[in-house]
């Protein structure tokens, strides 16, 4: 019996920047019950505040909701692993909530054959950022990645969209069934999942453009 | 303990390309973003680029782009920078930085000298 | 890019004397969300930078109190209220507002 292992604060996620959740790794536990709590302060203080909310993030977790979130100050946090035997800390973390967003996957993805008489035909792909990110005040530029395959293929083609919402592709091979999808990163932050997958149908008489 | 071992000393020709590797421990490799920051002798210092190796997502200063790519591989938990056709101004130590969850560098490499003479 | 300009070059100081270091930016280091990223870093001789200061103002983990960072839009300075022997080296300031995140010069700190 022994006491526990250090713990390590691996992942912070924000959605968009009004809430956040930390997760930890358990060191050993000595094998003992081992109790962890989460304590934080935030840049320019010195009082430090227990994890507002260990349930929603799930275990090992630490949930900030919208009244103890700030985009101003850097949050200095560490966790405290106790059992019968003794603690351990984890090293000190500092989060900006601004370098964490992870948003949610764009919206109402729609994609179209367009077949115009005087060039060549092409897929058009359109999508909307997602709903919780407000794009109107400037905190956030979002980019887009659009992945495509055929059905059958194991490969996926990739573009980079940039911080358009739409997107133009000219070489697909006629008579085939595509999936599309759509993932959106904020400039500093991370990768959202990919939406989920919209099909179309590549007519036999479409033009493959090289 | 957060550790950032690079790899030792070169020297390249002029024309020629070197990859200087940055060996994290001590934190799990894919929750931080590693930057590259170069150091003439006696000057100033000069932030080249940046990766997130948890999907090696990278962001470069446009001074070095077409020049410069970082690289990183999870299974080692190694950040590499490659830079192609070196010249003489290249001369410099070479630092890879961690970040937290935050854009300065708390973390540093110890630093590579890659001397660039014919 | 932002240009960084540091002053001066370098400081000769008496032990135990303050020390001033000013950082001057070409564009505001305030970002569209608020926040300031300035930073502050020393190099000691034969070492890697060390963060000292984040933020324009927050001492960084294990960074003694004489140190402090003021200053805000385009104006910075780093102050060291009585300069110790272990001080010496060049220090840095950082901007990581705008990409390219861009330092300062340097400014060599000896002791008299």
């Known amino acids: 019996q022994l006491p526990p292992g250090k713990p390590e604060i691996f992942k912070c996620r924000s959605p968009n920047k009004e809430t956040f959740t930390c997760w930890w790794r358990p060191g050993t536990d000595g094998g003992l019950p081992t109790n962890y709590s989460l304590t934080y302060h935030r840049e320019g203080e010195t009082l430090m505040h227990e994890c507002p909310d260990y349930i929603t993030g799930g275990p090992n977790s630490c949930h900030f909701g919208k009244q103890y979130t700030s985009m101003w100050r850097t949050y200095i946090m560490m966790v405290n692993a106790t059992n019968q035997m003794g603690s351990s800390f984890s090293d000190e973390l500092y989060v900006d909530v601004t370098y964490i967003v992870q948003p949610d996957p764009p919206l109402e993805l729609a994609v179209e054959v367009k077949q115009p008489e005087d060039r060549k035909p092409y897929l058009w792909i359109k999508w909307s950022p997602p709903t919780l990110i407000d794009l109107k005040t400037g905190w956030f530029t979002l980019l887009y990645e659009i992945r495509l395959k055929p059905e059958k293929a194991a490969e996926w083609e990739i573009h980079f969209a940039g911080q358009q919402t739409e997107f133009k592709i000219l070489s697909l091979h006629p008579g085939q069934k595509y999936l599309v999808q759509v993932r959106c990163k904020p400039d500093h932050g991370y990768w959202s999942a990919w939406s989920p997958a919209t099909f179309i149908q590549i007519p036999s008489d479409f033009t493959m453009n090289d | 303990e957060v550790q950032l071992v690079q790899s030792g000393a070169e020297v390249k020709k002029p024309g020629s390309s070197v990859k200087v590797s940055c060996k994290a421990s001590?934190?799990?490799?894919?929750?931080?973003?590693i930057h590259w920051v170069r150091q003439a002798p006696g000057q100033g210092l000069e932030w080249m680029g940046e990766i997130d190796p948890s999907d090696s997502y990278t962001n470069y200063n446009q001074k070095f782009k077409g020049r410069v790519t970082i690289t990183a591989d999870k299974s080692t938990s190694t950040a590499y920078m490659e830079l192609s056709s070196l010249r003489s101004e290249d001369t410099a130590v070479y630092y890879c930085?961690?970040?937290?969850?935050?854009?300065?560098?708390?973390?540093w490499g110890q630093g590579t000298l890659v001397t660039v003479s014919s | 890019d932002v240009v960084m300009t540091q002053t001066p070059l370098s400081l000769s100081v008496t032990p135990g004397q303050p020390a001033s270091i000013s950082c001057r930016s070409s564009q505001s280091l305030v970002h569209s969300n608020g926040n300031t990223y300035l930073h502050w870093y020393l190099q000691k001789p034969g070492q890697s930078p060390q963060l000292l200061i984040y933020k324009v103002s927050n001492r960084f983990s294990g960074v003694p109190d004489r140190f402090s960072g003021s200053g805000s839009g385009t104006d910075f300075t780093l102050k060291i209220s009585r300069v110790e022997a272990e001080d010496v080296g060049v220090y840095f300031c950082s901007q990581s507002t705008h990409v390219p995140f861009t330092f300062g010069g340097g400014t060599k700190v000896e002791i008299k």
């Open positions: 930085a961690r970040s937290f969850f935050t854009n300065w560098f708390a973390y």
């Open positions: 001590g934190y799990t490799f894919t929750s931080y973003w």
